[in-house]
């Protein structure tokens, strides 16, 4: 009888482990504004917080500016990027701006980078207004394999809003791969 | 034997209850336009539907204009806010508008409010065009504790689009806290 | 004893089947730009990829330009729509554009269509700039019944960005209906 119960319990524990929602990986990374690159061209943002304020990570890794997948699965990925400029910060080089975000996936096995999601807008930020602001939000559902890396590229990084509620990206696992 | 089975069944039922996805809290609240405040400054929106049309709520509470968390967990929060103006609605005070949304979390234990997500844009809505429209979308993954409250603040509330498909916010629990 | 075990195992397998996250439906559909309608009025987009690049589908069906629900449940739905214009593509008929997306649900039983989510912006795309771009993102949590269909309508379809990272929509099931 005990052997039978042990067998059932083993199965049960196995299911518990597998279905245990606590094990689902996630990350919510917020911009670290102490190290934002300058320029207006597309650059990769490598400085993000993972353990302060709203930033958190579990069963994923943050390393070298990239969010690394540790567990195969289908994930919902998202990013919110805010740009802003106040006249007291100085004059813009041009009123015509391309404010963009690109969420990219890099596979180490096949050293290649692909854009999963992009968003943004061309903007006319005239000197007639003392303050300008613009936010982009993108999100989507993607198959990610262990070892793959997610990174964020933006244009005009010097215009990024450094607040944790403004500029962030994240991921959470929704389900296993069949 | 029955005692053994009862014990296994007890464990199994416990797991079923815990992992039962039906128990996962969620809410999708749509704007109640019968009570939108005026002004152009940031205000908290307190009138939302929770049980008509697309609006719905389960294992969360809507009270005093706030979405109250009843179950600890990690939640995906989102908001979609649309602003619109037609020349027949009247003349705008300024062409330079700051159309913003702030998703805030309030803890009753520590009476403090913090912005989880923000988004929006400065817009130039000139009288040369008969119709203007702009939508904001924000989303992110956050740890919420029972008793914490989620609320929405916007600028220029009198410009909100009152349709249920336009102005709404919501949350759904993704996983437990470890 | 075996009968007892079989009974417990039956229950366990039933739970395994029901809670098995692998069974959760999802779809991520990317624009098929070989067949984008022209015009500036609101049109339904019927050409989407479901099995190439980032596009994928499981336990849902794509047919006649619509995403068909096969399994009752609460789903998170999302769409990202990008519009762009380069001066080399020709002159725009008007500088004042309404760039919009509508995510609609159609029930076959009751032949009616309802908008679940909308987003977008009015834009002034002047000839003074060689390139214009704008992206919309919407997302929300909805109860969907088997047989219901999700489709995407946009204004100005000829301005759509045809990249798979730019114009897409999707859904994933979060939980069962109680």
């Amino acid at each position: 009888i005990r052997a039978e119960k042990a067998m059932v319990d083993g199965s049960w524990l196995d299911l518990a482990k597998r279905s245990k929602l606590e094990a689902q990986p996630f990350a919510h990374l917020t911009i670290n504004a102490t190290d934002i690159p300058s320029g207006s061209h597309k650059v990769s943002l490598s400085s993000w917080y993972h353990d302060r304020g709203w930033a958190k990570i579990s069963n994923m890794t943050f390393s070298n500016g990239k969010l690394i997948v540790n567990q195969d699965g289908f994930y919902y990925l998202y990013a919110n990027i805010c740009f802003r400029h106040h006249e007291t910060s100085g004059d813009l080089a041009t009123e015509y701006l391309q404010l963009m975000v690109y969420v990219t996936k890099t596979s180490i096995k096949i050293p290649s980078s692909h854009t999963l999601m992009k968003g943004g807008s061309t903007k006319y930020w005239s000197g007639n207004s003392e303050f300008h602001f613009y936010s982009i939000n993108v999100g989507g559902f993607f198959k990610l394999r262990s070892g793959e890396e997610i990174s964020i590229e933006v244009s005009n990084p010097s215009l990024l809003d450094p607040d944790q509620d403004a500029t962030y990206f994240g991921a959470f696992k929704v389900r296993d791969i069949d | 034997i029955r005692a053994e089975k009862a014990m296994v069944d007890g464990s199994w039922l416990d797991l079923a209850k815990r992992s039962k996805l039906e128990a996962q809290p969620f809410a999708h609240l749509t704007i109640n336009a019968t009570d939108i405040p005026s002004g152009s400054h940031k205000v908290s929106l307190s009138s939302w539907y929770h049980d008509r049309g697309w609006a719905k709520i389960s294992n969360m509470t809507f009270s005093n204009g706030k979405l109250i968390v009843n179950q600890d967990g990690f939640y995906y929060l989102y908001a979609n806010i649309c602003f619109r103006h037609h020349e027949t609605s009247g003349d705008l005070a300024t062409e330079y508008l700051q159309l913003m949304v702030y998703v805030t979390k309030t803890s009753i234990k520590i009476p403090s409010s913090h912005t989880l997500m923000k988004g929006g844009s400065t817009k130039y809505w000139s009288g040369n065009s008969e119709f203007h429209f702009y939508s904001i979308n924000v989303g992110g993954f956050f740890k919420l504790r029972s008793g914490e409250e989620i609320s929405i603040e916007v600028s220029n509330p009198s410009l909100l689009d009152p349709d249920q498909d336009a102005t709404y916010f919501g949350a759904f629990k993704v996983r437990d806290i470890d | 004893i075996r009968a007892e075990k079989a009974m417990v195992d039956g229950s366990w397998l039933d739970l395994a089947k029901r809670s098995k996250l692998e069974a959760q439906p999802f779809a991520h559909l990317t624009i098929n730009a070989t067949d984008i309608p022209s015009g500036s009025h609101k049109v339904s987009l019927s050409s989407w990829y479901h099995d190439r690049g980032w596009a994928k589908i499981s336990n849902m069906t794509f047919s006649n330009g619509k995403l068909i629900v096969n399994q009752d449940g609460f789903y998170y739905l999302y769409a990202n729509i990008c519009f762009r214009h380069h001066e080399t593509s020709g002159d725009l008929a008007t500088e004042y554009l309404q760039l919009m997306v509508y995510v609609t649900k159609t029930s076959i039983k009751i032949p009616s269509s309802h908008t679940l989510m909308k987003g977008g912006s009015t834009k002034y795309w002047s000839g003074n700039s060689e390139f214009h771009f704008y992206s919309i993102n919407v997302g929300g949590f909805f109860k969907l019944r088997s047989g219901e269909e999700i489709s995407i309508e946009v204004s100005n379809p000829s301005l759509l960005d045809p990249d798979q990272d730019a114009t897409y929509f999707g859904a994933f099931k979060v939980r069962d209906i109680d």
């Epitope: 007639n128 003392e130 | 005026s38 002004g39 152009s40 400054h41 103006h85 609605s89 009247g90 003349d91 705008l92 005070a93 300024t94 062409e95 330079y96 508008l97 130039y124 000139s126 009288g127 040369n128 220029n156 009198s158 410009l159 | -």
Partner: nanobody, 126 residues
Framework: EVQLVESGGGLVQAGDSLRLSCAAA????????MGWFRQAPGKEREFVAA????????GYVDSVKDRFTISRDNTKNTVYLQMASLKPEDTAVYNC???????????????????WGQGTQVTVSS
């Protein structure tokens, strides 16, 4: 110090035209909504017209629509009120007013305006 100085008033015949000016100083003019009000003898002050910060939105009281035109020149910090087809009932002291945009729509109530000029007299004889 904030200053709003009206000019251009006077005595005219019914059917004539007049152009009022209001020169502003002491605040960032282009960020303020500008309005014109008037007060006839023995009556309360009433809203006449208002103009948005950038000048593309204008609002009028029904009685002056299609006869009066409000405009502004942000480079000169001046707001104007062009009055045509004047009537005896247009006789009043005309005041210029300014406010930051605290509402989405043009303010039409005098309590919504922060700064006021001394006024200029307009008299329309029949």
């Amino acid at each position: 110090e904030v200053q709003l100085v009206e000019s251009g008033g006077g005595l005219v015949q019914a059917g004539d035209s007049l152009r009022l000016s209001c020169a502003a100083a002491g605040f960032t003019f282009r960020r303020y909504v500008m309005g014109w009000f008037r007060q006839a003898p023995g009556k309360e002050r009433e809203f006449v017209a208002a103009i948005s910060t950038g000048g593309t939105w204008t609002g009028y009281v029904d009685s002056v629509k299609d006869r009066f035109t409000i405009s502004r020149d942000n480079t000169k910090n001046t707001v104007y009120l062009q009055m045509a087809s004047l009537k005896p009932e247009d006789t009043a002291v005309y005041n210029c007013a300014a406010t930051t945009p605290t509402t989405s729509y043009l303010p039409r109530s005098e309590r919504q305006y922060e700064y006021w000029g001394q006024g200029t007299q307009v008299t329309v004889s029949s």
